[in-house]
């Protein structure tokens, strides 16, 4: 499985609440001995490896905020410690995993990371994370709401889009190129055949310059089948970092469909043993 971040940037006014979301993609093992450990923490930009540094969220460590549940279960942090700090992490049946932060302050701005670990009977098998940025803005009216978007480093988007585009164009053009090469070779061999015929009859006629010869179209050449025009659909694609990239950087982000809206599950599932205070 992989972790995707539906949005990589959240911009919120002070005092608002925000729900940061990660989503599990791909097949998830739901065997009886498979469980998932999920948590959130803060990190810092400019690292060699994103999310490698771990910092607490409002003084709560990754272990304070963790969920641990079976592959078929939903869960949420029900202990008082997180709620006293205005935090709640939750996980639903559809692979959505979120942290809700209430009453945002400027100090909450920064890079947030989600971590998901697949555990198979006591053994940590698979660890993946996602990253997103939260920007809390001062002096906004309490009526305004948070904006979530996929804005990222435009250079990396352009590079990714160009690379993807070049690959697609290359793959689509390959049959066409091969066809043209085949045609060219057919035409060339036809010309050679005609020249040989002329050379045979040159005893009675003078040698003509083949360069000025206007060859009639060769009837034996198979016609290239007409193709329908190619349509290029821009869509969000998961990148290696778990973020979504636009295939076409100029395409605006489409609004989330009904399935994209995430409501954290609030089924009370008690917390697990925890090294930190519960």
């Amino acid at each position: 499985f992989k972790v995707a971040t539906p949005y990589s940037l959240y911009v919120c006014p002070e005092g608002q609440n925000v729900t940061l979301t990660c989503r599990l993609l791909g097949p998830v093992d739901k065997g009886h001995d498979v469980t998932f450990y999920k948590t959130w923490y803060r990190s810092s930009r400019g690292e060699v490896q994103t999310c490698s540094e771990r910092r607490p969220i409002r003084n709560l460590t990754f272990q304070d905020l963790h969920l641990h549940h079976g592959g078929h279960q939903a869960a949420n942090t029900s202990h008082d410690l997180a709620q006293r700090h205005g935090l709640e992490s939750a996980s639903d049946h559809h692979g959505n995993f979120s942290i809700t932060m209430r009453n945002l302050t400027l100090l909450d701005s920064g890079l947030y990371c989600c971590l998901v670990v697949e555990i198979r009977h006591h053994h940590s098998e698979h660890r993946v994370h996602g990253a997103m940025e939260l920007q809390v803005q001062a002096g906004k009216g309490s009526g305004s709401t948070c904006m979530a978007s996929n804005e990222q480093d435009s250079d990396s988007i352009t590079a990714a889009a160009l690379a993807t585009g070049a690959c697609i164009v290359g793959i689509l053009c390959l049959p066409l190129i091969l066809l043209l090469v085949y045609k060219q070779r057919q035409v060339a061999s036809h010309r050679r055949a005609q020249e040989l015929v002329r050379m045979d009859s040159s005893n009675t006629q003078g040698i003509e310059n083949p360069g000025f010869e206007t060859t009639p179209p060769f009837q034996g050449m198979p016609e290239a089948k007409t193709r329908p025009p190619l349509s290029y659909v821009a869509q969000r694609q998961p990148s290696e970092s778990g973020r979504y990239l636009l295939s076409d950087p100029s395409t605006p982000l489409s609004p989330p469909g009904p399935g994209d809206v995430f409501f954290p599950s609030l089924d009370p599932v008690p917390d697990s043993p925890n090294s930190e205070a519960i």
């Epitope: 670990v117 006591h122 940590s124 697990s272 043993p273």
Partner: antibody
Framework: QVQLQQSGAELMKPGASVKISCKAT????????IEWVKQRPGHGLEWIGE????????NYNEKFKGKATFTADTSSNTAYMQLSSLTSEDSAVYYC??????????????WGQGTLVTVSA | QIVLSQSPAILSASPGEKVTMTCRAS?????MHWYQQRPGSSPKPWIY???NLASGVPARFSGSGSGTSYSLTISRVEAEDAATYYC?????????FGGGTKLEIK
């Protein structure tokens, strides 16, 4: 705060059976494996086996099959280990430990204080 | 079963010294856990997943290794570090511990 409280020391006769208890508090007892570990005086730690209280699932070290039997009572948050046909080789401190998943890595996160079992004629 | 062999069995060091103890596995492992047991006490979780310190463990402790060879290092030994240290694998049943390295402070 997570705590595992074990029953007191036992002095047993060879051939007898003993049942050790481990009462858990501070977490959801049914969802985490309880591990049992043996430590003989001057020896290292030896894993006996485990029980998942919520389902009653058990796993045993082959060496202790027939010697140890695990049970759990979720109503009292207590796990039990019964040792049968005791010999002097069974004289040891027995620990219960709760699995903890820390940073996504399960390990023996919490330990009881240990129960000393002495087998003597 | 996976056998974990710890060496040395006994390690004697003076305060301030750097010490390293090793744990070798009979089969390759993804990671190793370490526990500290002081005399007369229960074992305590100490280092998880090869190199990560448990909450409250002093920063002078570190862990490293991969495959079949793992080690625990104390950069500057202190009197309170006197204990037996056990490595443990949770990769395959039966889950096993090493024989332990007893650290004595001179």
């Amino acid at each position: 705060q997570v705590q595992l409280q074990q029953s007191g020391a036992e002095l047993m006769k060879p051939g007898a059976s003993v049942k050790i208890s481990c009462k858990a508090t501070g977490y959801t007892f049914s969802r985490y494996w309880i591990e049992w570990v043996k430590q003989r005086p001057g020896h290292g730690l030896e894993w006996i086996g485990e029980i998942l209280p919520g389902s009653g699932s058990t796993n045993y070290n082959e060496k202790f099959k027939g010697k140890a039997t695990f049970t759990a009572d979720t109503s009292s948050n207590t796990a039990y280990m019964q040792l049968s046909s005791l010999t002097s080789e069974d004289s040891a401190v027995y620990y219960c430990a709760s699995e903890e998943v820390y940073d996504g890595y399960p390990w023996f996160g919490y330990w009881g204080q240990g129960t000393l079992v002495t087998v003597s004629a | 079963q996976i056998v974990l062999s710890q060496s040395p069995a006994i390690l004697s060091a003076s305060p301030g010294e750097k010490v390293t103890m090793t744990c070798r596995a009979s089969s390759s492992l993804s990671y190793m856990h370490w526990y500290q047991q002081r005399p007369g006490s229960s074992p305590k979780p100490w280092i998880y997943a090869t190199s990560n310190l448990a909450s409250g463990v002093p920063a002078r402790f570190s862990g490293s290794g991969s495959g079949t060879s793992y080690s625990l290092t104390i950069s500057r030994v202190e009197a309170e570090d006197a204990a037996t240290y056990y490595c443990q694998q949770w990769s395959s049943n039966p889950y096993t511990f090493g024989g332990g390295t007893k650290l004595e402070i001179k």
